[in-house]
């Protein structure tokens, strides 16, 4: 489980078509 103090940070993962982009790359979302 994610620690409580981490919950307001963005989490970054590799994905395709994420973060308003057409290609694959890193995407960070809260």
């Amino acid at each position: 489980r994610r620690r409580r103090r981490d919950t307001h940070f963005p989490i970054c993962i590799f994905c395709c078509g994420c973060c308003h982009r057409s290609k694959c790359g890193m995407c960070c979302k809260t």
Epitope: R3, D6, P10, F14, C19, C28
Partner: antibody, heavy 121, light 107 residues
């Protein structure tokens, strides 16, 4: 100005441990993901590990997973790399590098000067 | 197991255009970045997201990426551009690949 300064390198015997540090200045450290990248003598670049904004959000290259641990102390503006069970093939210059700002940080936009780690008996 | 392949060396005359390629499986589906490393120095980002230039990087540096090949183009090459160049792309959250590097010689 924006700066990254690595320290902690040196000569170490196989199987031993070493901890590298990277002191950041000139930017809001906690707002950036941070990487370690290494370069063996005369060779190319090899990504080692990244830690994103949350301490729990970190990833490692297969070559170091289970042996190396990346961490950060935002209160000290410092990035760390704890290296255990060192092998001869870990010999390299170790760079810390800042991930780009924003929601799509694909590139490494600021690099430190590097610190040399030599694993030899 | 993915890998990014670059030519070991490229030579160009001053003022001419240098082209450095980086090939990898479905590379065009990922964002490519390029780094310049002068001898004895740390890498410097020159291109990101295939074709974008960071502030302070001269306009003579440009990039493209489609299919299986990303390309770094240096137009009007200068002596100061002599360096090693590395491409880079993400293939997963735990797999950031760099090309083997290309040594650019300005004759």
């Amino acid at each position: 100005q924006v700066q990254l300064v690595e320290s902690g390198g040196g000569v170490v015997q196989p199987g031993r441990s070493l901890r590298l540090s990277c002191a950041a200045s000139g930017f809001t450290f906690s707002s950036y993901g941070m990487h370690w990248v290494r370069q063996a003598p005369g060779k190319g670049l090899e990504w080692v590990a990244v830690i994103w904004y949350a301490e729990s959000n970190k990833y490692y290259a297969d070559s170091v997973k289970g042996r190396f641990t990346i961490s950060r102390d935002n209160s000290k503006n410092t990035l760390y790399l704890q290296m255990n069970s060192l092998r001869a093939e870990d010999t390299a210059v170790y760079y810390c590098a800042r991930a780009q700002e924003g929601i799509a940080p694909d590139a490494f936009d600021i690099w430190g000067q590097g610190t040399m780690v030599t694993v030899s008996s | 197991c993915y890998e990014l392949t670059q030519p070991p060396s490229v030579s160009v005359s001053p003022g001419q255009t240098a082209t450095i390629t980086c090939s990898g499986d479905k590379l065009g589906e990922r964002y490519a970045s390029w780094y310049q490393q002068r001898p004895g120095q740390s890498p410097v980002l020159v291109i990101y997201q295939d074709s974008k230039r960071p502030s302070g990087i001269p306009e003579r540096f440009s990039g493209s990426n489609s299919g299986n090949t990303a390309t770094l183009t240096i137009s009007g090459t200068q002596a100061m551009d002599e360096a090693d160049y590395f491409c880079q792309a993400w293939y997963s959250s735990t797999n950031v690949l760099f090309g083997g590097g290309t040594k650019l010689t300005v004759l």
